[in-house]
Amino acid sequence: LVPHLGDREKRDSVCPQGKYIHPQNNSICCTKCHKGTYLYNDCPGPGQDTDCRECESGSFTASENHLRHCLSCSKCRKEMGQVEISSCTVDRDTVCGCRKNQYRHYWSENLFQCFNCSLCLNGTVHLSCQEKQNTVCTCHAGFFLRENECVSCSNCKKSLECTKLCLPQIENVKGTEDSGTT
């Protein structure tokens, strides 16, 4: 089976790399525009220049193209705690990230929120905080992990998952009480 190609891909595949087929005349291959520019006018004929113009401020193209308009620069989402790592240029979109000692949590493919890295109080760092992952903590005895914080077993209710982790502590306490009553 032949893989299904979109119209644009079909048209481009007829021309050598770095060129595209003229939309009005499929016998002409025009040179694509460099990154940082966009297509203003198709080439008038074979071997003639494509009319490419530089992207205006606030827009970009990151690869060679034959787009009629540049792409709008992304804005970092302040409400999600994002900060600008590098500003938009004609050939590169804005790069957004998080502050020091924070990590990105992706709610979806194109949406992330910045959160503070866990400090592992009442525990030890098992894996350090990374760009896209919070610190992984291991809790000290008598503590259990809840929402990536080490919480005292005294806050463990019977209905919660922590009972498995905190049960040895409870049994130890019982054991010491029992051994004292001989």
Partner: nanobody, 119 residues
């Protein structure tokens, strides 16, 4: 005590419209970014849309872009989600929530309102 009460769900035909509301109390509404998330039957939570404190910055998931509109009325402490051109895949329980602060979980979200899109 934070309270979020969603309303406006129901059974609607494909292509129809619904407007969800979320009445908020127990916190300073004007200081919080508000979120709509949804959970389709047998699936996880999906981030639908959010709106910043003043209603200036909004975000929409690709699946709802151009069809849904989020808004808020700070004088009424109410969040809205206008849903147009509804599709069967929009069937879900819709929850309003405060933007998480401490970590990637929802400390405060409502009980939800069911939207069923079916002919």
């Amino acid at each position: 005590e934070v309270q979020l009460l969603e309303s406006g769900g129901g059974l609607i035909q494909p292509g129809g419209s619904l407007r969800l509301s979320c009445a908020a109390s127990g916190f300073t509404f004007t200081k919080e970014t508000m979120v709509w998330v949804r959970q389709a039957p047998g699936k996880g939570l999906e981030w639908v849309s959010h709106i910043d404190r003043v209603g200036q910055d909004t975000y929409y998931a690709d699946s709802v872009k151009g069809r849904f509109t989020i808004s808020r009325d700070n004088s009424k402490n109410t969040l809205y989600l206008q849903m147009n051109s509804l599709r069967a895949e929009d069937t879900a329980v819709y929850y309003c929530a405060l933007l998480p602060k401490r970590g990637p979980w929802f400390d405060y979200r409502g009980q939800g309102t069911l939207v069923t899109v079916s002919s």
